[in-house]
């Protein structure tokens, strides 16, 4: 499911409950995706010992995964709500190609991988409604994404395992950083 249980507009199981605000809905959506990532990481960590490796040992890779930096305005120091929101949305859009790559990488968690991908699309929509400066958001080029996907899928098995691990870890860190920032807004 692309949204957490109880979030669907058709869900009327709890009429006494206050409808969630935009911020609460975004918060809950991120936590839902993080739970999904956690389940996917369990499968990858059971298959290899990469999860025990230090970040330094895995730093040498050609992946250009989105990462929060001081200049993005999402940290406590130098916090800037508008700049940060643009970074979060841009970063999520950039992660979409990597989430597409993950789709055929799981045996027992295939549905979970799909849920993470679809939930991220919903999260982007939620955030775009919140953002005032949509013009500043750059959408990745579809042709570039297609060739990147082909390149990633052509890697040998070990590199594909490494790529899967790095995508999940980076996406988790990006979402955690995003959540911390959104909770300051």
């Amino acid at each position: 499911a692309p949204v957490p249980p109880g979030e669907d507009s058709k869900d009327v199981a709890a009429p006494h409950r206050q409808p969630l605000t935009s911020s609460e809905r975004i918060d809950k959506q991120i936590r839902y995706i993080l739970d999904g990532i956690s389940a996917l990481r369990k499968e990858t960590c059971n298959k290899s010992n990469m999860c025990e490796s230090s970040k330094e040992a895995l730093a040498e890779n050609n992946l250009n995964l989105p990462k929060m930096a001081e200049k993005d305005g999402c940290f406590q120091s130098g916090f800037n709500e508008e700049t940060c929101l643009v970074k979060i949305i841009t970063g999520l859009l950039e992660f979409e190609v990597y989430l597409e790559y993950l789709q055929n990488r799981f045996e027992s968690s295939e549905e979970q991988a799909r849920a993470v991908q679809m939930s991220t699309k919903v999260l982007i929509q939620f955030l775009q409604k919140k953002a005032k400066n949509l013009d500043a958001i750059t959408t990745p080029d579809p042709t570039t994404n297609a060739s990147l996907l082909t390149k990633l899928q052509a890697q040998n098995q070990w590199l594909q395992d490494m790529t899967t691990h790095l995508i999940l870890r980076s996406f988790k860190e990006f979402l955690q950083s995003s959540l911390r920032a959104l909770r300051q807004m």
């Epitope: 936590r31 993080l34 230090s54 001081e70 860190e173 950083s177 911390r180 909770r183 300051q184």
Partner: antibody, heavy 118, light 110 residues
Framework: CQSLEESGGRLVTPGTPLTLTCTAS????????VTWVRQAPGKGLEWIGI?????ETAYATSAIGRFTISKTSTTVDLKMTSLTAADTATYFC??????????????WGQGTLVTVSS | AYDMTQTPASVSAAVGGTVTIKCQAS??????LSWYQQKPGQRPKLLIY???TLASGVSSRFKGSGSGTEFTLTISDLECADAATYYC????????????FGGGTEVVVK
């Protein structure tokens, strides 16, 4: 066996800068968040700050500008400036396993005592 | 700013009895609350996280409950070894806060 150990605590005079170091054994700190907490004699726990990745930090309002946390793969430093007698406390570092979104500290060092006195 | 208020400051009960400690957040923190036990001269020990999940190796006599702004730690079948100070800690947001921890509750076992 995984453990944390703080070092660098000593008697200093007011205004002297001091750096405390938290060292990990049995695991790499690069995979975890690390927080600093202090406890004045006979008082409760006071949260100081946390370091997430290599460069994202958050601090308690009273620590902003005076305390700085930095990280390598094996250590986390707490740099303290403009120390006063009110900073006299046992300083603990603690690990957050960073697997979720909420901060919780499941591995603690034994603490290092900092005494600020003239 | 997610201030944590813990009550009472001190509580006393007999061996075999039950004590209840309350923790109140100034704003909703979902279920993102942990409880710690600290004995004199020792480091704190994580007991409960996510309001009600027992940390590894912690006795089931410790029970956490609550959500939003109101939380409770209940210790049943009190043992002498439970004599300690207990702290709640919000893990919802560590930005622009004075302290993530509550003021602490001393539990005296008679």
């Amino acid at each position: 066996c995984q453990s944390l150990e703080e070092s660098g605590g000593r008697l200093v005079t007011p205004g002297t800068p001091l750096t405390l170091t938290c060292t990990a054994s049995g695991f790499s700190l690069s995979n975890y968040y690390v927080t600093w907490v202090r406890q004045a004699p006979g008082k409760g726990l006071e949260w100081i700050g946390i370091i997430y990745g290599s460069d994202e930090t958050a601090y308690a309002t009273s620590a902003i500008g005076r305390f700085t946390i930095s990280k390598t793969s094996t250590t986390v430093d707490l740099k303290m400036t403009s120390l006063t007698a009110a900073d006299t406390a046992t300083y603990f570092c603690a690990r957050d396993d960073s697997s979720d979104w909420d901060a919780k500290f499941n591995l603690w060092g034994q603490g290092t005592l900092v005494t600020v006195s003239s | 700013a997610y201030d944590m208020t813990q009550t009472p400051a001190s509580v006393s009960a007999a061996v075999g009895g039950t004590v209840t400690i309350k923790c109140q957040a100034s704003q909703s923190i979902n279920n993102e609350l942990s409880w710690y036990q600290q004995k004199p001269g020792q480091r704190p020990k994580l007991l409960i996280y996510r309001a009600s999940t027992l940390a590894s190796g912690v006795s089931s006599r410790f029970k956490g409950s609550g959500s939003g702004t109101e939380f409770t730690l209940t210790i049943s079948d009190l043992e002498c070894a439970d004599a300690a100070t207990y702290y709640c800690q919000q893990g919802y947001s560590l930005r622009n806060i004075d302290n993530a921890f509550g003021g602490g509750t001393e539990v005296v076992v008679k």
